[in-house]
């Protein structure tokens, strides 16, 4: 049976086997087409989600679709039901928490009172001044907290206590990519991880350990990527994996936070990378132990210079490494998180591509997660 499962797929009505390589090849090989059902699916960027959270204390902002202007949500008459609606608009199903925070001196958006209309937040028509003088600080999910804070050094062995959101994404029990837990159902990774194998069946996620072989595998229900754009072939290197069963969070299995929409990190901002990838550029093998390293944001202009990536790094990517080189992600780290710590840990990047590993002028290039928040929210909403 194991051999059959490894090399063949069983079609129903009438029952017969087809070679596994015919799964997800774009041809209907089973009479009912089930060989093309459980495949990596693409999902468009979709419409603008009309709510967002700012890095200014996770304050809620609402879009006026008529004018295209954004407004900050006033705390006056804001309720748990409105908080749930806001989070549902972003695709969250968990119970949110919210609190009042004082309107700051740098508040640049108009502040309006919020109401609800057909399960979407709206601005109250006759909105007067914000009497409470407070904004809504909203958290849709408890995230980005670990049991242990890493020390700032070069490269060292990591503990799952520090990075409880890190997962190993495996095909046929072989580690292919890293990934990050975003909520009980969803794992964030890179789209290029699925280039070779587009059938969902054989992909598994392993969570809760820093050692590659030692933890149970979780079944995957769906793998979703963005529609391919030939004008920007290296953009959109992002994928969401929906797990068949929700994760139970613990000290070693927890979600990382998504970045805020306005999370602009300046050059030299310290960041962290983790993974089980190659420790040498051309070989060796995967590391059995999770490794961690501190890096920093590298200016896109520098990264696009003639001796570096020559303009290939787009607005939806970011570079990170250390100026002198030597610390970088490598093959096998793909899909894993590039992380920034403020109050919580945020996944600001996804390990995507680069020329070599650790070269001084060619640092790692990462998918900029904040550029894809809209897509993530639209996927989640479609799957609620």
């Amino acid at each position: 049976k194991v051999i059959l499962d490894k090399y063949y797929f069983l079609c129903g009505q009438p029952l017969h086997f087809i070679p596994r390589k015919q799964l997800c090849d774009g041809e209907l090989d089973c009479p009912l087409g089930e060989d093309e059902e459980h495949c990596v699916k693409s999902f468009p960027e979709g419409p603008a989600v009309a709510v967002r959270l700012s890095k200014d204390r996770s304050t809620l902002q609402v879009l006026d679709s008529a004018t295209g202007n954004w407004f900050s949500a006033c705390f006056d008459n804001f309720t748990e039901a409105l908080a749930e609606t806001a989070c549902r608009q972003m695709g969250y199903s968990s119970k949110p928490t919210f609190r009042a925070v004082e309107i700051g001196p740098d508040q640049d958006l108009d502040v309006v009172e919020i109401t609800e209309n057909s399960q979407e937040l709206r601005m109250r028509n006759s909105s007067g001044p914000c009497l409470s003088g407070s904004l809504v600080s909203l958290h849709c999910l408890a995230c980005g907290k670990s049991l242990k804070t890493p020390r700032v050094v070069g490269v060292e062995e990591a503990s799952v206590d520090s990075w409880p959101w890190q997962v190993s994404i495996q095909y046929d029990k072989q580690h292919v990519c890293g990934g990050s837990i975003l909520d009980p159902h969803w794992v964030l990774t890179a789209a290029h991880c699925f280039r070779k194998h587009t059938d969902v069946f054989n992909w598994k996620v392993r969570a809760g350990s820093d050692k590659l072989g030692s933890f149970p595998s979780l079944a995957v229900a769906k793998i979703i990527i963005i529609e391919f754009n030939p004008m920007y072939p290296k953009d959109n290197d992002i994928a969401l994996m929906k797990l068949q069963f929700p994760l139970t969070f613990s000290g070693t299995v927890r979600p990382i936070c998504l970045p805020f929409f306005d999370e602009e990190l300046t050059p030299a901002t310290p960041l962290w990378i983790i993974g089980w990838g190659f420790t040498k550029q051309n070989g060796g093998k995967m590391s059995d132990i999770l490794l961690q390293a501190s890096v920093q944001v590298i200016d896109s202009t520098r990264c696009n210079a003639d001796d570096a990536y020559q303009g290939e790094v787009t607005e939806k990517m970011m570079c990170a490494g250390i100026p002198e080189g030597g610390v970088d992600t490598c093959q096998g780290d793909s899909g894993g998180p590039l992380m920034y710590q403020s109050d919580q840990w945020h996944v600001v990047g996804i390990v995507s591509w680069g020329y070599g590993c650790g070269g001084p002028s060619t640092p790692g290039v990462y998918t900029k997660v904040s550029a894809y928040l809209n897509w993530i929210y639209n996927v989640w909403k479609a799957e609620l």
Partner: antibody, heavy 116, light 107 residues
Framework: QVQLVQSGAEVKKPGASVKVSCKAS????????MHWVRQAPGQGLEWMGW????????GYAQKFQGRVTMTRDTSTSTVYMELSSLRSEDTAVYYC?????????WGQGTLVTVSS | DIQMTQSPSSLSASVGDRVTITCRAS??????LNWYQQKPGKAPKLLIY???RLQSGVPSRFSGSGSGTDFTLTISSLQPEDFATYYC?????????FGPGTKVDIK
Amino acid sequence: QVQLVQSGAEVKKPGASVKVSCKASGYSFTSHYMHWVRQAPGQGLEWMGWMNPNSGNTGYAQKFQGRVTMTRDTSTSTVYMELSSLRSEDTAVYYCARLGQQLDYWGQGTLVTVSS
Amino acid sequence: DIQMTQSPSSLSASVGDRVTITCRASQSIRNYLNWYQQKPGKAPKLLIYEASRLQSGVPSRFSGSGSGTDFTLTISSLQPEDFATYYCQQSYSAPPTFGPGTKVDIK
């Protein structure tokens, strides 16, 4: 510096095929998609399709599906565009181009004239 | 496919004039809009990418604005070498499509 050098002008009869070449230099050939765009005399620009020189994968505009084939020779860093079943309305200048944010480079163009 | 329209289709202007060309997409393309300049017998040249970002080496008299469906290319002070045809192009989704062009000639 990046250069895309195309083959010379061609005159073809209706029903025939034409194969235009585009030789790339000054960058890593397999790292960038190549696109083909055409422009009929006095008309606008029309995108035909793309090729990934690394994998050989291609994508064609619906209008040209079944008539266009894009291939590459990595040993010479050359991409080819072949258009078959030519008709008079295929008379145009054909450009190869490396497109994308900030990465815009075009060949000098190849005039293909289809005439009986 | 996303349709792109441009207006005007042609315009006559003098050196030093401020020139504005508009481009409209049949659906929202966010800021995935490029502007090209083409002179007779030459390949197109990229001026502006992502609606408002100036391509390296392009004079600062060229600027772009807009997002969603409506976009504008502005030449603040027309120079003799700017007489050409200008095309907008969306790169939001495949296939990339071009506007029909705006010819700018000497008054």
